[in-house]
């Protein structure tokens, strides 16, 4: 299985390669075969990645910021390939390789242009600040400076703030919105051009639920097909907001199945779950339990959030008795 | 065809420098490694020096070391050779050498020389 | 540094005669050896690398064998135009040393 790069041609044998942060990459290069084989890798013309020639490495003047992270394919030489094996790419390693490849026929020079992109996973959270309710799109970090965008009932708001902090290697950003009072359906997306990699965040605010104390209340979360693919590894949680934070009260891992439950009156249907229905039913309900509750399911490219406003009223015994 | 032309010899006196040039042609020159070989009227080849393709890398036999400097210049397509505190026994032809590849095997094709000479 | 040291340092033989010339270097040099041909008056001229690959254009009459120390270069049937001086030189790593030489004539 090789690494997660792409190879772009482009003409005057210089290619494209697309790598990501940390991850381990190749960059092609290939002769005619022939005898006395001699394969110089360098960086930027400059500095010394990899030499192989008389049938072996030679790494002494080898830059040492390419120490124990670069190998030939050594089995693959006398066939004609030349490709440099690269260990955890960063930032730093991003630019111009040139591989000079010769044999007692020809030399030959090809040049690899390395980029590399980063992207952690992003998340939308949703947050209550004071009276004012904000979703804010967050990437903790990412290379290139991403594309983020916010729809409004589908629709693209032009309103768009972005708190930006860089690091050496990296961008991380923030990007809030504020929701205050709107009962729309609110979608952020996240895009790495280099990566080819996009994110979406939706947020959907369900009508509001009036509930009698002891009665149980359902709550619905089924992910939109747009963006859910089951066969891909996802994680559902349930949280209740109280006094301006979240308490976790289920969740459930796609990869293990398994179901973590921290409240005694919450119920999943595990039918449901098979059916990637994550609705679930709190019983028994009592006065404190009033407030918005949040489903979130998340991937690596989406989070799908849904809120609830639960209502619990007293029930008329209750009433009475007061 | 590999054509390797030098020139730059000439009579000198002890001590002095004299820098000897190596047109080459026919070739992708920035592609090789190149030698100096000298070789006194009559006797053998002494190997003198050795610069890889992009110029990283040089070599000298003791002989010389610390007094000949070879280098190149590969947008001119020339290989150089300053030699200083020039001694009377560096007197020879000089051959400017072309490397089968990148200035880490044996030379495949010969200038014609220039003759130094070291005399008081 | 590995010293090359050849022999004989000269020798005459009839056209038509089988002629070796040795080469022995001081420390292993794997097959990293190649032979040159120096006529009077003219370059050198590259017969054998990789101890016995025959370079192009090279008469089939001109061998090279052996690995490590000991190296043989070998006329199978000497010719007028094969007067000429003998160099082996080791490539394995710089100094990229050459041999004395061998002078070899006709009788």
């Known amino acids: 299985i090789f690494p997660l790069a792409f190879f772009i041609y482009v003409p005057m044998n210089e290619q494209i390669v697309i790598g990501r942060l940390d991850e381990d990459i190749i960059l092609p290069s290939s002769f005619e075969r022939g005898s006395e084989v001699v394969i110089h890798w360098k960086y930027q013309d400059s500095y010394k990645v990899h030499s192989y020639y008389k049938g072996s490495d030679h790494l002494e003047s080898q830059d040492p910021r390419y120490a124990n992270r670069t190998s030939l394919f050594y089995n693959e030489i006398q066939n004609g390939n030349a490709s440099l094996f690269f260990r955890r790419v960063s930032l730093l390693d991003e630019g111009i390789y040139t591989c000079y490849v010769g044999t007692a026929i020809q030399v030959i020079t090809n040049k690899v242009v390395l980029k590399v992109g980063v992207f952690l996973t992003p998340v939308m959270k949703y947050e209550k600040r004071n009276t004012n309710s904000f979703l804010i799109c967050s990437v903790l970090s990412v290379y290139p400076r991403p594309i983020i965008t916010w729809k409004m009932d589908n629709t693209p708001i032009s309103e768009n703030n972005m708190e930006e902090t860089g690091s050496l290697d990296s961008f991380s950003i923030n990007s809030p919105l504020n929701i205050t009072g709107s009962n729309s359906s609110y979608e952020c997306t996240i895009e790495n051009s280099l990566l080819k990699q996009t994110w979406t965040g939706r947020w959907t605010m369900k009508d509001g639920l009036h509930k009698m104390q002891s009665e149980h209340v359902s709550l619905s979360c089924q992910p939109v097909n747009d963006y859910f693919s089951p066969n891909q590894d996802f994680k559902v949680t349930w949280s209740r907001m109280k006094s301006g934070t979240f308490s976790v009260l289920a969740y459930y891992l796609s990869s293990s199945q398994n179901t973590i439950i921290n409240e005694s009156r919450f119920s999943w249907n595990k039918e449901l779950i098979n059916q990637s229905d994550f609705s679930m039913n709190l019983m028994d309900l009592n006065l404190s339990d009033s407030g918005e509750y949040l489903c979130n399911i998340s991937s690596d490219e989406y989070t799908l959030l849904t809120i609830h406003t639960v209502h619990v009223e007293p029930s008329q015994e209750t009433a009475s008795h007061n | 065809q590999v054509q390797l032309v030098e020139s730059g010899g000439g009579v000198v006196q002890p001590g002095r420098s004299l820098r000897l040039s190596c047109a080459a042609s026919?070739?992708?020159?920035?592609?090789?490694?190149m030698h100096w070989v000298r070789q006194v009227p009559g006797k053998g080849l002494e190997w003198v020096a050795v610069?890889?393709?992009?110029?990283?890398?040089?070599d000298y036999a003791d002989s010389v070391k610390g007094r000949f400097t070879i280098s190149r210049d590969n947008s001119k397509n020339t290989l150089y050779l300053q030699m200083n505190s020039l001694r009377v026994e560096d007197t020879a032809v000089y051959y400017c050498?072309?490397?089968?590849?990148?200035?880490?095997?044996?030379?495949?094709?010969w200038g014609q020389g220039t003759l130094v000479t070291v005399s008081s | 540094d590995i010293q090359m040291t050849q022999s004989p340092s000269s020798l005459s033989a009839s056209v038509g005669d089988r002629v070796t010339i040795t080469c022995r270097a001081s420390?292993?040099?794997?097959?990293?050896l190649a032979w040159y041909q120096q006529k009077p008056g003219k370059v050198p001229k590259l017969l054998i690398y990789?101890?016995?690959t025959l370079q192009s254009g090279v008469p089939s009459r001109f061998s090279g064998s052996g690995s490590g120390t000991d190296f043989t270069l070998t006329i199978s049937s000497l010719q007028p135009e094969d007067v000429a001086t003998y160099y082996c030189?080791?490539?394995?790593?710089?100094?990229?040393?050459f041999g004395p030489g061998t002078k070899v004539d006709i009788k």
């Open positions: 026919g070739f992708t020159f920035s592609n090789y490694g």
């Open positions: 030189q080791k490539y394995q790593s710089a100094p990229f040393t």
């Open positions: 990789a101890a016995s």
């Open positions: 050498a072309k490397d089968l590849i990148s200035g880490i095997y044996y030379v495949d094709h």
């Open positions: 610069i890889w393709y992009e110029g990283s890398e040089k």
């Open positions: 420390q292993g040099i794997s097959n990293y």
